[in-house]
């Protein structure tokens, strides 16, 4: 058993049929010694008396808010949560496996630049009685500071018969140098509590590996005289690290119709303009990627050919 | 420690091409190592990230773009003195800071070159003959060093009398390649910045 926060405790249980469970001793936070009784949740049934209560925690029915009283007055609470371990593996029931970039990916994180600011998100099908708390650091032994905000519900989607909820959090490394060469990874730890179930999820990464620039901005077309070719130009996204001559991007320019199966014109360039062949009912799209360290491409920025 | 904005004529920076070749060569070599040593811990997640130049050179700090010198997190107190002549310095107006930056890059390359050559000598003794260093990568390191053209003491190649542990050598190769790739990215960014200045 360990303390998650004040008056909230996590009991780690090996979860299998007829498991013996864990013996837990609760102590009432009071100077009083006599006339103390214990109850669980909203029940008025007295579980025991005395300053300490010893319980055998085996299942969710044994978890909950234990309260000690004296003469009708509440003295203190202890909330017990369960953390299940099945076949030596901690349960991951609360969050959905996103399977990208690999299986057992519950947290996904992205950074728009090298400033040390990043966003992580996760998915769940649970809609109520759900809380998250996020901590982060650079490195695990002798950790350096990363400050994370509160996790918020950022999107709701319908997937078949189920509703899916996306939560996200923004974090900022306390003293980040965009030019630094990372040798210690960022660690992100999410505590998830659904009703009386506790789970924790972690992710470890270098900012350089989660970079995904915003799409290029200000796409413009200029038809070339006596030609089917057009010159397309664009600018670096505002959120990208500066100076751009140091943090350079490379671009992919594509002309394509509405269907992905349609024919296309595609060219890669380090410049902020390119010449392509425009077709009727097609769009010109441009996306960006760090020129020197190949992490993710940005989303496409598009303009119609016409 | 920073790079001044007034530096060589645009497009005349002779080291940019070599640094691009360097990044390409080390990236290819790292990819080859990951594939060949698939049953060894050779991915970014599996290895310890060590920097053999730590406390010996200060490339990131010495080569910091002027725009980032206002960022206190980027300023490091490490002081390193280097020789200040080099053929990549295409303008007489080149400052001492830029010379310091380029000589720091040169020292990085020299250190990695020695490590890679020592390692290759060990890998050539491996009866499995599983992996060797790409000669192209070694050649590209040499070309960039020649383009930088700094005079400095020759670092003797480390020779070891004991029987090499090939497993450890291959793990060390992965660690070295990952670190060198990261440094090659920094070098490329620096050269691109200088070329544009």
């Amino acid at each position: 058993i360990w303390e998650l926060k004040k008056d909230v405790y996590v009991v780690e249980l090996d979860w299998y049929p007829d498991a013996p469970g864990e013996m837990v001793v609760l102590t009432c936070d009071t100077p009083e010694e006599d006339g103390i009784t214990w109850t669980l949740d909203q029940s008025s049934e007295v579980l025991g008396s005395g300053k300490t209560l010893t319980i055998q925690v085996k299942e969710f029915g044994d978890a909950g808010q234990y309260t000690c009283h004296k003469g009708g007055e509440v003295l203190s609470h202890s909330l017990l949560l369960l953390h299940k371990k099945e076949d030596g593996i901690w349960s991951t029931d609360i969050l959905k496996d996103q399977k990208e970039p690999k299986n057992k990916t519950f947290l996904r994180c992205e950074a728009k630049n090298y400033s040390g600011r990043f966003t992580c998100w996760w998915l769940t099908t649970i809609s109520t009685d759900l809380t998250f708390s996020v901590k982060s650091s650079r490195g695990s032994s002798d950790p350096q500071g990363v400050t994370c905000g509160a996790a918020t519900l950022s999107a709701e989607r319908v997937r078949g018969d189920n509703k899916e909820y996306e939560y996200s959090v923004e974090c900022q490394e306390d003293s980040a140098c965009p030019a630094a060469e990372e040798s210690l990874p960022i660690e992100v730890m999410v505590d998830a509590v659904h009703k009386l179930k506790y789970e924790n999820y972690t992710s470890s990464f270098f900012i350089r590996d989660i970079i995904k620039p915003d799409p290029p901005k200000n796409l413009q077309l200029k038809p070339l005289k006596n030609s089917r070719q057009v010159e397309v130009s664009w600018e670096y996204p505002d959120t990208w690290s500066t100076p751009h001559s140091y943090f350079s991007l490379t671009f992919c320019v594509q002309v394509q119709g509405k269907s992905k199966r349609e024919k296309k014109d595609r060219v890669f360039t380090d410049k902020t303009s390119a010449t392509v062949i425009c077709r009727k009912n097609a769009s010109i799209s441009v996306r960006a990627q760090d020129r020197y360290y190949s992490s993710s491409w940005s989303e496409w920025a598009s303009v119609p050919c016409s | 420690r920073n790079l001044p904005v007034a530096t060589p004529d645009p497009g005349m920076f002779p080291c940019l091409h070599h640094s691009q070749n360097l990044l390409r060569a080390v990236s290819n070599m790292l990819q080859k190592a990951r594939q060949t040593l698939e049953f060894y811990p050779c991915t970014s997640e599996e290895i310890d990230h060590e920097d053999i130049t730590k406390d010996k050179t200060s490339t990131v700090e010495a080569c910091l773009p002027l725009e980032l010198t206002k960022n206190e997190s980027c300023l490091n107190s490490r002081e390193t003195s280097f020789i200040t002549n080099g053929s990549c310095l295409a303008s007489r107006k080149t400052s001492f800071m830029m010379a310091l930056c380029l000589s720091s890059i040169y020292e990085d390359l020299k250190m990695y070159q020695v490590e890679f050559k020592t390692m290759n000598a060990k890998l050539l003794m491996d009866p499995k003959r599983q992996i060797f260093l790409d000669q192209n990568m070694l050649a590209v390191i040499d070309e960039l060093m020649q383009a930088l053209n700094f005079n400095s003491e020759t670092v003797p190649q480390k020779s070891s009398l004991e029987e090499p542990d090939f497993y450890k050598t291959k793990i060390k190769l992965c660690i070295l390649l990952h670190a060198f790739r990261i440094r090659a990215v920094t070098i490329d960014r620096v050269m691109s910045y200088l070329n544009a200045s």
Epitope: R228, Q229, T250, R261, E262, K263, K264, D265, R266, V267, F268, T269, D270, T275, I277, R279, K280 | -
Partner: antibody
């Protein structure tokens, strides 16, 4: 299986024209760009131009501009390359090529040898 | 026009040994570079697109690298069926242009 079948070999006199055909099978004809590339004996490959069969748009290499015409007939899934004012240096194997990507080729025809000789 | 220069023009290799062919562009073409294989009397076949993207059906012993002006096609271990002429082609701008070809022959 995508295939491009070209017309047979031709012998032409200098100053005349030649029209080579390329019939496509497998996949929808208008879903691909069609190019013509030639190879003189013992020489490398030389790009001549492309057509978008969907709308008839064409683009020619400046070297052949005014002498080459590329057309396409969607009803027969056939593309044509006509080269006029032939000279001896036009002796080459002419290949048609196609791809959904405009700037390179994933399928090429078997080639048509055009000999220009007096 | 962008001029593509291949080297060497002829490359004698022992079967089972690796081979590397270089292609240089007269100006920077990013990764807009493709490799083809051509055997005598046959049409060319696409091996690699955009400098390093492998093509389905092409053996994994063929790999490409490079960007900007310098590109390399590598065959990790030459098989008897790999003896052929190899061409690079740039797609950075029209007109599309090819290298002059590298003939890989049995040593």
């Amino acid at each position: 299986q995508v295939q491009l079948v070209q017309s047979g070999a031709e012998v032409k006199k200098p100053g005349s024209s030649v029209k080579v055909s390329c019939k496509a099978s497998g996949g929808t004809f208008s879903d691909y760009y069609l190019h013509w590339v030639r190879q003189a004996p013992g020489q490398g490959l030389e790009w001549m131009g492309w057509i978008d069969p969907e709308n008839g748009d064409t683009e020619y290499a400046p070297k052949f501009q005014g002498r080459v015409t590329i057309t396409a007939d969607e009803s027969t899934s056939t593309a044509y390359m006509e080269l006029s004012s032939l000279r001896s240096e036009d002796t080459a194997v002419y290949y048609c090529a196609r791809n959904k990507e405009l700037r390179y080729f994933d399928v090429l025809g078997q080639g048509t040898l055009v000999t220009v000789s007096s | 026009d962008i001029v593509m220069t291949q080297s060497p023009l002829s490359l004698p290799v022992t079967p089972g040994e690796p081979a590397s062919i270089s292609c240089r562009a007269s100006q920077s073409i990013s990764i807009n570079l493709h490799w083809y294989q051509q055997k005598p009397g046959q049409a060319a076949r696409l091996l690699i697109a955009f400098a390093s993207q492998s093509i389905s059906g092409v053996p994994s012993r063929f790999s490409g690298s490079g960007s900007g002006t310098d590109f390399t096609l590598t065959i990790s271990s030459l098989q008897p069926e790999d003896f052929a002429t190899y061409y690079c082609q740039q797609s950075n701008s029209f007109p599309l242009t090819f290298g002059q070809g590298t003939k890989v022959e049995i040593k």
